[in-house]
């Protein structure tokens, strides 16, 4: 039960995270015009990974795409790449994790196969989340560097009569969406990896059979503690036959963690 819950929650958290990464990547407000300590402008500038926009005081908004590929800063290209890699890995991870979910039965797929798929999707989510966090952090670092450079420029080179007001940019909403989304995807991936441990059979899980001698009630349990750990591939309580030999599952009266699947 706990494994299923962990896996399901990991899937949902990752799904929300990846949706957030996609949203952040598409958003135009990666950087927004810094309004603090600046002349009051009748326009508001903001930029995304794919286009820059200007909202005029009338409410009219005009956006222009970055139609050049070679003319763009290498850092911006790197951020784009990181975000796209994050989305692709996350999307593949989601696809894999759907088939790995314990609550979804596909033919006679073994739990070991589901465990492997869960681990694979978990790792993909972790890498996806890290890519998003890295991408957003690189962009944020670029903004901070440019912010202080433009601040320095504002107070230098003003010997002439004509002044050019430097437009300074600060963190936009997309950065925060990206950080949160990346974090959620990362957390979801970790949860999937944890769930994988609960699904994976560590050794061959023999059926523990107790033989009832006529005078004594002595049980022979091969496999040591493994028979009762709940990590085995037995998901149903099965009678082997109606005689004296019973499965270990029947001997235990408390439910195992797989009883309610």
């Amino acid at each position: 039960m706990a494994v299923t819950a962990c896996q399901g929650l990991g899937f949902v958290v990752s799904l929300i995270g990846i949706a957030g990464i996609i949203a952040a990547t598409c958003m135009d407000q990666w950087s927004t015009q810094d309004l603090y300590n600046n002349p009051v402008t009748a326009v508001f500038n903001y930029q995304g990974l794919w286009r820059s926009c200007v909202r005029e005081s009338s409410g009219f908004t005009e956006c222009r795409g970055y139609f050049t590929l070679l003319g763009l800063p290498a850092m911006l290209q790197a951020v784009r790449a990181l975000m796209i890699v994050g989305i692709v890995l996350g999307a593949i991870g989601l696809l894999v994790s759907i088939f790995a979910l314990k609550c979804i039965r596909i033919g006679s797929m073994e739990d070991s196969a589901k465990a492997n798929m869960t681990l694979t999707s978990g790792i993909m989510f972790i890498v996806s989340g890290l890519c998003a966090i890295a991408g957003v952090s690189v962009f944020a670092n670029m903004l901070v560097t440019n912010f202080w450079m433009s601040t320095a420029n504002m107070y230098t080179g003003m010997g002439g009569m004509v002044q050019t007001v430097q437009t300074r940019y600060t963190f936009g909403a997309a950065l925060f969406v990206g950080w949160v989304a990346g974090g959620l995807t990362l957390i979801g991936g970790v949860m999937m990896c944890i769930a994988c441990r609960g699904l994976a059979p560590e050794e061959t899980n023999y059926k523990a059979v107790s033989y009832h001698a006529s005078g004594h009630s002595v049980a022979y349990k091969p496999g040591g503690f493994k028979a009762s750990t709940g990590f085995g591939s037995n998901t149903k309580n099965k009678k082997i036959y109606d005689g004296g030999a019973r499965t270990e599952d029947e001997v235990q009266s408390y439910p195992s963690k797989h009883d309610y699947v």
Epitope: T41, S52, V54, E56, S57, S58, E62, V162, V165
Partner: antibody, heavy 120, light 113 residues
Framework: EVQLVESGGGLVQPGGSLRLSCAAS????????MHWVRQAPGKGLEWVSY????????YYVDKLKGRFTISRDNAKNSLYLQMNSLRAEDTAVYYC?????????????WGQGTLVTVSS | DIVMTQSPDSLAVSLGERATISCKSS????????????LAWYQQKPGQPPKLLIY???TRESGVPDRFIGSGSGTDFTLTISSLQAEDVAVYFC?????????FGAGTKVEIK
């Protein structure tokens, strides 16, 4: 046809108050920012104040802050300018103007103006 | 505040001749975000309110004759009337549309010689 009609001007004594109104028609008033601009007799144009379509943000020329208040009533398609502590130098024709959409913040339609005379 | 300096104060031109008005701003009116200039030109005839002629430094407002030509970028702008007509006698104002307060030039009076 876009129409802006100012009213409320007149003769007022120094230190007095006046409320100017601007009735708008021929366009969706609630979608546009509005300006007040004034022109002293025989002088140039002086921008006074701006109010956005949703009443925020609002901007004023620094020297009039605190004395003049711009407001609007979208339900009545009306723009207002409350002028307090009036001085002789406030004597001017007051125009209301529409902040044009997609015209780089220019003022695309103007009213005929209302004359405010501050004199004792 | 942005200071808009217009020159000349007045201009007398013969009918059919070219009239050129200059406007300089104390700060660049070029917005880096969209590489557009935020400067407008208005025409005011005696006893009338101003009328928008040019916005964005060079775009004519609809209904404005094509003899009115706006040019310039950054801090230096020009309004040219390519062939002056009798109905063009008026005062012309330039306006900063990028920074609040939105400031106007002092105006240039165009007359017929």
């Amino acid at each position: 046809e876009v129409q802006l009609v100012e009213s409320g001007g007149g003769l007022v004594q120094p230190g007095g108050s006046l409320r100017l109104s601007c009735a708008a028609s021929g366009f969706t008033f609630s979608s546009f920012g509005m300006h007040w601009v004034r022109q002293a007799p025989g002088k140039g144009l002086e921008w006074v104040s701006y109010i956005s379509s949703g009443s925020s943000p609002i901007y004023y020329v620094d020297k009039l802050k605190g004395r003049f208040t711009i407001s609007r009533d979208n339900a009545k398609n009306s723009l207002y300018l409350q002028m307090n502590s009036l001085r002789a130098e406030d004597t001017a024709v007051y125009y209301c103007a529409r902040a044009g959409y997609a015209v780089r913040n220019a003022l695309d339609y103007w009213g005929q103006g209302t004359l405010v005379t501050v004199s004792s | 505040d942005i200071v808009m300096t217009q020159s000349p104060d007045s201009l007398a031109v013969s009918l059919g001749e070219r009239a050129t008005i200059s406007c300089k701003s104390s700060q660049s009116l070029l917005n880096v975000g969209n590489q557009k200039n935020y400067l407008a030109w208005y025409q005011q005839k005696p006893g009338q309110p101003p009328k928008l002629l040019i916005y964005g430094a060079s775009t004519r407002e609809s209904g404005v004759p094509d003899r009115f030509i706006g040019s310039g970028s950054g801090t230096d702008f020009t309004l040219t009337i390519s062939s002056l007509q009798a109905e063009d006698v008026a005062v012309y104002f330039c306006q900063n549309d990028l920074f609040y307060p939105l400031t106007f030039g002092a105006g240039t009076k165009v007359e017929i010689k």
